[in-house]
C-alpha cells in the first residue's frame, strides 16, 4: 500500500490529550501500529496503540497527563510518528511536525441543563471541559435544537461568536418535546475544528394556560 492514499490526522484538546487517526488504503485490518509523540522541549514522550475503527482506519489517544493539566503551549512542536510492525521490526509509516495550538479540537461541552423553561422559551446553560486557560474568552459556540418530526441535520445552526455558556431559545411551541446540542471551537489555529456535539439535552416546553391566547 506504499502508493495508496494515507492520512494521518491529529488534534490537541488544549490540555493533556492528542487524538490521532491513521488511515491507509489497502492496509490489513490486523496490522499492529502505534503513534509515538516526541516533543521538542519536554522531557516526556508518549506512545499509544492504534486500534481499528473502520476497514482501513485506526485511532488512538495520546494521554499526556492528568485531564486538566496544561502539558503543551503555543510554542511546542511535537514530532508524531506512525510505526507499524513488519515482521520483527517496526517501520515508520508517517511523520508529522505537530503544532498543538494549530490543530485544536476541544472536548464536547458538558453539564447541559435547563435553567428556566416557559411555554415558548427555554434558557439552557452548559460548561466547557478540559479547555486551556490560554483561550481566555476566545471561543465560539454552535448550537442546534431538534424539533419533533425533524432530524439533527435539518436543525438550523445558532452561532454564538463569543464565550457565552448559555442560550435562550425562543419561538418554541408549547407542550412540545425538544432536544438541544452545543459544540465549541477556539478561534486560534489554522487546522482547528469544532468539538464533537454535546450529549443531547431533552426538555419539554410548558403547556399553554387554558383559556389564554397563545
Amino acid at each position: 500500500a506504499v502508493n495508496g492514499t494515507s492520512q494521518f490526522t491529529c488534534f490537541y484538546n488544549s490540555r493533556a490529550n492528542i487524538s490521532c487517526v491513521w488511515s491507509q488504503d489497502g492496509a490489513l485490518q490486523d496490522t499492529s501500529c502505534q503513534v509515538h509523540a516526541w516533543p521538542d522541549r519536554r522531557r516526556w514522550n508518549q506512545t499509544c496503540e492504534l486500534l481499528p475503527v473502520s476497514q482501513a482506519s485506526w485511532a488512538c489517544n495520546l494521554i499526556l497527563g492528568a485531564p486538566d493539566s496544561q502539558k503543551l503551549t503555543t510554542v511546542d512542536i511535537v514530532t508524531l510518528r506512525v510505526l507499524c510492525r513488519e515482521g520483527v521490526r517496526w517501520r515508520v509509516m508517517a511523520i508529522q511536525d505537530f503544532k498543538p495550538f494549530e490543530n485544536l479540537r476541544l472536548m464536547a461541552p458538558i453539564s447541559l441543563q435547563v435553567v428556566h423553561v416557559e411555554t415558548h422559551r427555554c434558557n439552557i446553560s452548559w460548561e466547557i471541559s478540559q479547555a486551556s486557560h490560554y483561550f481566555e474568552r476566545h471561543l465560539e459556540f454552535e448550537a442546534r435544537t431538534l424539533s419533533p418530526g425533524h432530524t439533527w441535520e435539518e436543525a438550523p445552526l445558532l452561532t454564538l461568536k463569543q464565550k457565552q455558556e448559555w442560550i435562550c431559545l425562543e419561538t418554541l411551541t408549547p407542550d412540545t418535546q425538544y432536544e438541544f446540542q452545543v459544540r465549541v471551537k477556539p478561534l486560534q489555529g489554522e487546522f482547528t475544528t469544532w468539538s464533537p456535539w454535546s450529549q443531547p439535552l431533552a426538555f419539554r416546553t410548558k403547556p399553554a394556560a387554558l383559556g389564554k391566547d397563545t
Epitope: A1, V2, N3, G4, T5, S6, Q7, F8, Q24, D40, I77, T79, R81, M93, A94, I95, Q96, D97, F191
Partner: nanobody
Framework: QVQLVESGGGLVEAGGSLRLSCAAS????????MGWFRQAPGKEREFVAA????????LYADSVKGRFTISRDKSKNTVYLQMSGLKPEDTALYYC????????????????WGQGTQVTVSS
C-alpha cells in the same frame, strides 16, 4: 500556489555522487514537509526520501538507505538529496514534492510537484 524547481541532475559513473536541490517558492509555501520521488522509463514513480521542515525528521526508501541523505536549508527554502554510491538502477527522473502536513512513502500524499531533474548512472 507553491513552485518547486529541481536542479543538480546529470550523468555520473557508477559509484559516483550527485547532489540534487529543490527550491521552494510562492506565497502559499508554509514550512511544508518535502520529499523526493523518482521514475525510471517504463516504471511507476517511487518514493526515495522525505523530510519534515521543522524538526528535520526523515524517511527513506529501503533501496537508498545508507547511500542517500536528505536535508533542508530553512533560510533558503531548499531541500537537498545527497546521493552517493550511485548504481545504474538509480537512473531516473527525480521529482521534488511537497506535502501539506505529513510525510509518508505514498505519492498521493504529496500536493505540489516539480518538473523533475534527470539522473543517469552509467556502468
Amino acid at each position: 500556489q507553491v513552485q518547486l524547481v529541481e536542479s543538480g541532475g546529470g550523468l555520473v559513473e557508477a559509484g559516483g555522487s550527485l547532489r540534487l536541490s529543490c527550491a521552494a517558492s510562492g506565497r502559499a509555501f508554509n514550512n511544508f514537509p518535502m520529499g523526493w520521488f523518482r521514475q525510471a522509463p517504463g516504471k511507476e514513480r517511487e518514493f526515495v526520501a522525505a523530510i519534515t521542515w521543522i524538526s528535520g525528521s526523515t524517511l527513506y526508501a529501503d533501496s537508498v538507505k545508507g547511500r542517500f541523505t536528505i536535508s533542508r536549508d530553512k533560510s533558503k527554502n531548499t531541500v537537498y538529496l545527497q546521493m552517493s554510491g550511485l548504481k545504474p538502477e538509480d537512473t531516473a527522473l527525480y521529482y521534488c514534492a511537497a506535502a501539506l502536513k505529513t510525510i509518508t512513502r505514498g505519492q498521493h500524499d504529496y500536493t505540489y510537484w516539480g518538473q523533475g531533474t534527470q539522473v543517469t548512472v552509467s556502468s
